[in-house]
Every structure is written in structure tokens, then in C-alpha cells.
């Protein structure tokens, strides 16, 4: 019984969670593994260490669930001394979903749009900065925020601990066995652990990150983690691990920001939002039309509708204002979701038909999903009309006209023109049929 049972103290500084089971309720420590500040890993049981190269690493593996998560690291930019998280690859059954640092998502190497649902996996985007992969049937949630060099693997509380392997360790509330190698033996040396779970992609070479460590400790900015600003979060998640990591990297501005962002993310996951960024300190810049919010509730609103479920916890990032929804990376009014954009840039309503400029033989229709369907209209065989005297039938096609038409045009060459009469007493002959081809006087 959870009300009477002892609440455990969790080794990863997390707050224990209730797990309702058939035989009652029990307390357990959440299985959360985080990566932050470019290279720091905090295991399920709270051990922490640094990745030392731009390479690929197995973070988490569960053979029983046919699930594997791989982190791909690389230089932040060509020749850069810093390493960055380039992508997170989630393999499940026959699917390989890769979340890239440029916020693109590929499934088995093919680019897909988000939200994406497939093979028991759901992918959502939050605040234009964070991707989330949910396994509703397993209860796992994985997130990747490349802008902060941060990932979070949150396993279902019902996960059978001993079936997890990789750099994130074994979630069994025992930090001593987190550094487990593939053969089941445990090492105390984190460098051996990292080496063990390093995998090489075809054509990729693993290179050490030659980042210069901090020689002068000045962790004044890390103090933010200990301020009353985070007091509510301190109640659910002790900041000690993150403060220690921050102090190690205090001379690198991005890394200080990344560590604090990672702690703030865990706070949000636990229901506590902290507005810690300022214009002068770790500011997050948003693309045009989006606005920053440190605590956005509800599902991201996309034109495609909410085809997948999403987390009930708040998120940070760049969002559309309340009256707008996301469409291809920018915010649009909701009515724009059903509108189609023609080649000329003109908006057309759902089921509206139009003839595009300079393509008079096409008729285009705006269908659902903002798809434009254009068909070419066939031309009937043109029939030559019966023309009047001195007229000949000729085919004509204007630029804005699809099918050619016959028209009667004057043909003086083939015409028997009457003589112009000679008038007396200074009178002039007058035309009795102006506009016609054969004049009458």
C-alpha cells in the first residue's frame, strides 16, 4: 500500500513514483537517463560520466522489447573543438527512427513529416526544439533537444530492470552495477564502459573531442541551479548532480546553459516550470512568427490535426500564438490549414476550382490536406463556321484560351469588291453596311 509503504530515496535524485499493480500499489524510482552539456551522461541510477569522442554510442538496449537507442555525436561544426549531439536513433522491430539535430526526422532513412505514427511509435515535436518518441504499448518516452545538446530516456516504471543494457545502465536503484559490459561483467572505469558501448557507423571514424577543460573554476553562473528560483523543483529533484556537472564545464557558456536547461527539463517533467532564461543569460531565440514560452501546456497544434498522443507535461520552446497553428515550420491562422496555395502563390479555399494563369487547359481543385489536383481539359474538334461574303474561316487561340476556335475574318483578296459610285454636285458616297467585309454604297 503506497499510503503506508515507505517512500524510497532514489539514487538518481528523482522523486519516487506510484505504480498501481494487480496486487496493490508500490513505490518505485523512475528510470530516467539524461544526456546534457554536450557530453555528460547521467545513468538510470544516477552515475555520471563524460563521452570523450565524436562517435556513436549505445545508450539503451532491451533485447526482449527489440528496442535500441543510439546517440550519434560529432563536431558541432567543421573543425570545431566542441562535440555536439548530431542525432538520436531509435530502433524498434523493423523501424529505425532518427531524430536529427536540424529537427528533421527520418524513418528507415526516408524523410517524414511530424507528427508521425508508425510501428507502435509516435513522434511529436514540441516548441520547434524538442522531438519526443512515445511507445504507448511499452510506456517509454524518449526526447531529444539538439539545441540544448540534451536527451532524456524515460522508461516505463514497469520496465523489468535487468533487461536494460548500454551507457544508461541498469535501472534497479543500484548505481554499483550501472557500468555493465556486454558480457554482463561490471567495470568501475567509465572509459572502459564508453569504449564497450561505442559503435561505428559505416564511413564514420571515431575521433576524440579535444575540448579544453576549465583551468580557472568560476561557477558563479551555476549558482542559478541553487537559487530560490528553482526552490519548487528542489523538492522533487535534487540539483547536486547537475550543479557538479555545471561546475566542471563552467568556462563554456553553451555548456552552462545546456546543464541548466537539462535540469529545468527534468523539473518540467515533474510538473515544475521555472522561468530561468533572461535576455542576457542563455536566451533562446525563436524563428519569426513563433514566440518563446518556458511552460507551454497541451499538445502542439499542427495543421494535420492531433494524429498522435502527446505528453501531458509542459514544454519549453518556440510556439505559435494561441490563435495560430503550426504549418511547415511557421504559424498560420487555422483557416489556412484547409487552403491550398496555387503555383502563383494565390490561396484557394477547400474544393475551390480555378484555371491557373498561363495554363488555360488546366483546371485545378483544392482537396483535403492542402493538396492541389490539376487536370487537363480535352479540346473538341473545332467546326468551321459558315462565313459571309468576302470572309474566310480562320483558327484562333488567345493566350488565356485553352481550345482554338474558328472565327470569320475579312479576306479582301478573294472578294469581288463593288465599284465606288461617283456622286455629283460635290456629294460623297456613304457606306450603308459599316463593319462588314463587302462594302455597300
Amino acid at each position: 500500500n503506497c499510503d503506508r509503504g515507505l517512500r524510497p530515496s532514489c539514487p538518481n535524485s528523482q522523486s519516487p513514483v506510484k505504480v498501481e499493480e494487480t496486487c496493490g500499489c508500490r513505490w518505485t524510482c523512475p528510470c530516467v537517463c539524461t544526456g546534457s552539456s554536450t557530453r555528460h551522461i547521467v545513468t538510470f541510477d544516477g552515475q555520471n560520466f563524460k563521452l570523450t569522442g565524436s562517435c556513436s554510442y549505445v545508450l539503451f538496449q532491451n533485447k526482449e522489447q527489440d528496442l535500441e537507442v543510439i546517440l550519434h555525436n560529432g563536431a558541432c561544426s567543421p573543425g570545431a573543438r566542441q562535440g555536439c549531439m548530431k542525432s538520436i536513433e531509435v530502433k524498434h522491430s523493423a523501424l529505425s527512427v532518427e531524430l536529427h539535430s536540424d529537427m528533421e526526422v527520418t524513418v528507415n532513412g526516408r524523410l517524414v513529416s511530424v507528427p508521425y505514427v508508425g510501428g507502435n511509435m509516435e513522434v511529436n515535436v514540441y516548441g520547434a526544439i524538442m522531438h519526443e518518441v512515445r511507445f504507448n504499448h511499452l510506456g517509454h518516452i524518449f526526447t531529444f533537444t539538439p539545441q540544448n545538446n540534451e536527451f532524456q530516456l524515460q522508461l516505463s516504471p514497469k520496465t523489468f530492470a535487468s533487461k536494460t543494457y548500454g551507457l544508461c545502465g541498469i535501472c534497479d536503484e543500484n548505481g554499483a552495477n550501472d557500468f555493465m559490459l556486454r558480457d554482463g561483467t561490471v567495470t568501475t572505469d567509465w572509459k572502459t564502459l564508453v569504449q564497450e558501448w561505442t559503435v561505428q557507423r559505416p564511413g564514420q571514424t571515431c575521433q576524440p573531442i579535444l575540448e579544453e577543460q576549465c583551468l580557472v573554476p568560476d561557477s558563479s553562473h551555476c549558482q542559478v541551479l541553487l537559487l530560490p528560483l528553482f526552490a519548487e523543483c528542489h523538492k522533487v529533484l535534487a540539483p547536486a548532480t547537475f550543479y557538479a556537472i555545471c561546475q566542471q564545464d563552467s568556462c563554456h557558456q553553451e555548456q552552462v546553459c545546456e546543464v541548466i536547461a537539462s535540469y529545468a527539463h527534468l523539473c518540467r517533467t515533474n510538473g515544475v516550470c521555472v522561468d530561468w532564461r533572461t535576455p542576457d543569460f542563455c536566451a533562446m531565440s525563436c524563428p519569426p512568427s513563433l514566440v518563446y514560452n518556458h511552460c507551454e501546456h497541451g499538445c502542439p497544434r499542427h495543421c494535420d490535426g492531433n494524429v498522435s498522443s502527446c505528453g501531458d507535461h509542459p514544454s519549453e520552446g518556440c510556439f505559435c500564438p494561441p490563435d495560430k497553428v503550426m504549418l511547415e515550420g511557421s504559424c498560420v491562422p487555422e483557416e489556412a490549414c484547409t487552403q491550398c496555395i496555387g503555383e502563383d502563390g494565390v490561396q484557394h479555399q477547400f474544393l475551390e476550382a480555378w484555371v491557373p494563369d498561363h495554363q488555360p487547359c488546366q483546371i485545378c481543385t483544392c482537396l483535403s490536406g492542402r493538396k492541389v489536383n490539376c487536370t487537363t481539359q480535352p479540346c473538341p474538334t473545332a467546326k468551321a463556321p459558315t462565313c459571309g461574303l468576302c470572309e474566310v474561316a480562320r483558327l484562333r487561340q488567345n493566350a488565356d484560351q485553352c481550345c482554338p476556335e474558328y472565327e470569320c475574318v475579312c479576306d479582301p483578296v478573294s472578294c469581288d469588291l463593288p465599284p465606288v459610285p461617283h456622286c455629283e454636285r460635290g456629294l460623297q458616297p456613304t457606306l450603308t453596311n459599316p463593319g462588314e467585309c463587302r462594302p455597300n454604297f
Partner: antibody, heavy 113, light 112 residues
Framework: DVQLQESGPDLVEPSQSLSLSCTVT?????????WHWIRQFPGNKLEWLGY???????TYNPSLHSRVSITRDTSKNQFFLQLNSVSTEDTATYFC??????WGQGTTLTVSS | DVVMTQTPLSLPVSLGDQASISCRSS???????????LHWYLQKPGQSPKLLIY???NRFSGVPDRFSGSGSGTDFTLKISRVEAEDLGVYFC?????????FGGGTRLEIK
Amino acid sequence: DVQLQESGPDLVEPSQSLSLSCTVTGYSITSGYSWHWIRQFPGNKLEWLGYIHYSGTTTYNPSLHSRVSITRDTSKNQFFLQLNSVSTEDTATYFCGREGYHWGQGTTLTVSS
Amino acid sequence: DVVMTQTPLSLPVSLGDQASISCRSSQSLVHSIGNTYLHWYLQKPGQSPKLLIYKVSNRFSGVPDRFSGSGSGTDFTLKISRVEAEDLGVYFCSQTTHVPLTFGGGTRLEIK
């Protein structure tokens, strides 16, 4: 790679103020690290004067605190040392540096009337 | 202030010999975050000091592996396994754990 270059006068009169500049190339002084001024007296003794953090905060050697000031111009990627009320004892080679990894070549200053 | 005492003041060696320089601090250099910020520099005539070893035992990039650092708390040592001509100059230890940052008085490595 990062490079630092000191510049300033060769000679300053006693009781005057000394101003030195350090121009940094290859790295932004607002991106990270602390940026230091150190001096070396004739006879090799090294003395740390102070630093300006990438965030703009400063830390000084208490023995010089009332006389020393370090500022920066982020648009030019430069930081500066000002030492007031100099005396002949401030005759030294002045170095600027990043953390301790990289130092400039130094500029030699003589305080003399 | 933390006083850094280097010994010897001068160290005459033959090329190929091992050299050892000691540095002692007046108080512990272990920072509250667990790191020990003790570093070693080499200064050649007319040049600025160049970093050799940082945080007691880490070789800076490009520094030959004949240089090694060791020690803890208040006692530290720099060793050169086989002295080469390019190693001659003045060696300084430095601590950045406490403000003000301080330097040792220097050890001149010279040919016997």
C-alpha cells in the same frame, strides 16, 4: 586557433595610468573562458592581476584591487587592463591570456620619469 | 595568498637524463568541486610561458609524453623522463584553485 596580442605604451611616467589592450582572434571572448592579465617582473617573478569572465564579471588580485580595472569591447573582441597610479615597481612585461592555455607574446612596459 | 614554493631554483642536467621539479603549496589545492587546479609551464627566453601540464597530470595538446605530472593536496612534481635540448628554460608551477592565482618562483633547467 586562438591568438592574443597585447598592445600599449612602452613608457609611462610615475603616478600616471597605464592602459593596455589585448586583441583576440580565433575565438569570441563572450563564448567562454576567463580572460586574464599577468605580468612578469625582471628576474622572472610572475604576478596575476585579474580576469574578465566570458559573462563580463571581473575578479582581481586583492593586492592591486584599488588600482586595477579590466574591461572589454565585445564588438572588437578585445579586453583591456587599466592600472592607476603606477610606480617604478610596475615595470614589467605584461601578458594577456585565455585561462592559462594561451598567452600573448607580451608587451614590455617601463615606468620612469 | 597561497604561496607556491618551487625547488630547486636551478637544475643542471645532461641531455638524456631524467629531471624532476618539485612544487609545494602553502594550502591544499583541492577545489570544492573535487578538481586540483595545479598547472606547469615552460618559458623559453624571449617567449611567453607555454602550458605543459594542467590539473596536476593532464598533458596539453602537442606536449611530448616525456613530460608527466603527479601529486596531490599540497605536493606536486613535474618529471621529464629524457631531457632534450628544446626542454631547456624556466619551469613554473601555478595554482588556479584560490584567488589570487599564484605562481611558483621558477626552476631553471640548464645543461651541466
